[in-house]
């Protein structure tokens, strides 16, 4: 029997064992987080699947993910939201130590999808494990990109108090308007709920003593945020290794000096 024709995309296909992975992650998350014990993981998977299965994978919309967002609704306490841009690993290492702060990937929906790829095919109930649309080469309205845009928008919209963002000081554009942070989250912080955005610029080189808070792209971020009536603060994190160590052991004598 000849295999049925399948759309070829430029990106890698759906992550192996995607349904099992999502379900297993959901069960694990709800076991570890008492406030989410009421979540029915089968319903969550059904809503996740419903967002992209049998739909043309270059025509996915935010609306498609709203049922999943509805089931995964979670609140972060004020002052406890940590956004990040191009420095995911350090942000996650930080919240693993500072347990009362949360990145998107510490929330149920972000946790379910972190590092996974998925897509379906128009008019079939199959998942495409061969290839999925690439954001640049194929289309931006693909299942993965739209998912992250949707949940990132919601995460920013619900933030309150002082919001923190970790930025990568080693990149040519420390603040990139085209990143998810720059294109989605910045514009969805609610001025009536968010008093300030505090940027932590993470230095890469050990001998780098420049004040990266004076970088032109940081000034651009400050301008965008200030125009939205949200105060802006910036801190250099010169030694990320020491920074993490001091989060773990704040009483350490070396932590009294700058990091």
């Amino acid at each position: 029997v000849l295999p049925r024709w399948r759309q070829q995309w430029s990106g890698s296909g759906t992550t192996s064992r995607f349904p099992e992975t999502v379900l297993a992650r959901c069960v694990k998350y709800t076991e570890v987080h008492p406030e989410m014990r009421h979540v029915d993981c089968q319903s969550v998977w059904d809503a996740f699947k419903g967002a992209f299965i049998s739909k043309y994978p270059c025509n996915i919309t935010e609306e498609d993910y709203q049922p999943l967002v509805k089931l995964g609704t979670q609140t972060v306490p004020c002052n406890k939201t940590l956004l990040w841009s191009r420095i995911k690993d350090l942000a996650h290492q930080f919240t693993q130590v500072q347990r009362d702060m949360f990145t998107l990937e510490d929330m149920l929906l972000g946790y379910l999808a972190d590092d996974l790829t998925w897509c379906g095919e128009f008019n079939t109930f199959e998942i495409n494990y061969q290839s999925c649309p690439d954001w640049r080469k194929d289309c931006s309205n693909n299942p993965v990109s739209v998912f992250w845009k949707t949940v990132s928008r919601r995460f920013a919209e619900t933030a309150c108090g002082v919001v923190h963002v970790m930025l990568n000081g080693s990149r040519s554009k420390i603040f990139d308007k085209n990143s998810t942070f720059g294109s989605v989250e910045v514009h969805n912080l609610q001025p009536e709920k968010v008093q300030a955005l505090e940027a932590w610029v993470i230095h890469g080189g050990r001998e780098d003593s420049r004040d990266l808070c004076q970088d032109p792209t940081i000034k651009e971020l400050e301008s965008i945020i200030s125009k939205r009536n949200i105060r802006f603060f910036c801190k250099n994190i010169y030694r990320p290794d020491k920074f993490l160590q001091c989060v773990k052991n704040p009483e350490d004598s070396s932590c009294l000096s700058g990091i």
């Epitope: 029915d40 419903g50 935010e62 609306e63 709203q66 967002v69 089931l71």
Partner: antibody, heavy 119, light 107 residues
Framework: EVQLLESGGDLVQPGGSLRLSCGAS????????MSWVRQAPGKGLEWVAD????????WYADSVKGRFTISRDNSENTLYLQMNSLRAEDTAVYYC????????????WGQGTTVTVSS | QSVLTQAPSASGTPGQRVTISCSGS??????VSWYQQLPGTAPKLLIY???ERPSGVPDRFSASKSGTSASLAISGLQSGDEADYYC??????????FGGGTKLTVL
Amino acid sequence: EVQLLESGGDLVQPGGSLRLSCGASGFTFSDHYMSWVRQAPGKGLEWVADISARGSNTWYADSVKGRFTISRDNSENTLYLQMNSLRAEDTAVYYCAKNWNYNYGMDVWGQGTTVTVSS
Amino acid sequence: QSVLTQAPSASGTPGQRVTISCSGSSIQNNYVSWYQQLPGTAPKLLIYRNFERPSGVPDRFSASKSGTSASLAISGLQSGDEADYYCASWDDSLNWVFGGGTKLTVL
């Protein structure tokens, strides 16, 4: 034929209770989110409550939160609305409706059952 | 107070094209559906998922959505189209919300 049939509407005194039922036929009831929507005399439609396909999640309008409870029995293909602490402003025709793929729209409606709250 | 705003009334003569609008911030990221309620009857789904028609709904009924507003167009107006028309969507809390309704009169 796809059908929803409400029952249980009545005249009840303020502070009283009532349970509405909605029987479903012609579709796989357990696959669909369901809603209750009401319409006060001469007024527009007002969403009241939703329940997920498996019954594990429920959502309510602020106006009924803490007083009304939506539930379902998938083995009996029946949707319920338990209404307690009824007020005059709860007087309305109550419709049950099937949700098409969560948020596409409400594609099947019952004929409605009338609840009157008055002393 | 509904977060979806509709004009209370609209009118047209037989054969004409009329448009009913619906606006609200939650429309931007949520599907819009449209319902027709003939006098003394239950609502009926006319449009789902912003612009799609269920089978059995004539193609005289069409809809569109742009940004925070949506509209329903009825062409070739007939006396039988006289009814109340409601838009619906999910609100910012991801719960259903209906517009206040537009009463369509065929002159």
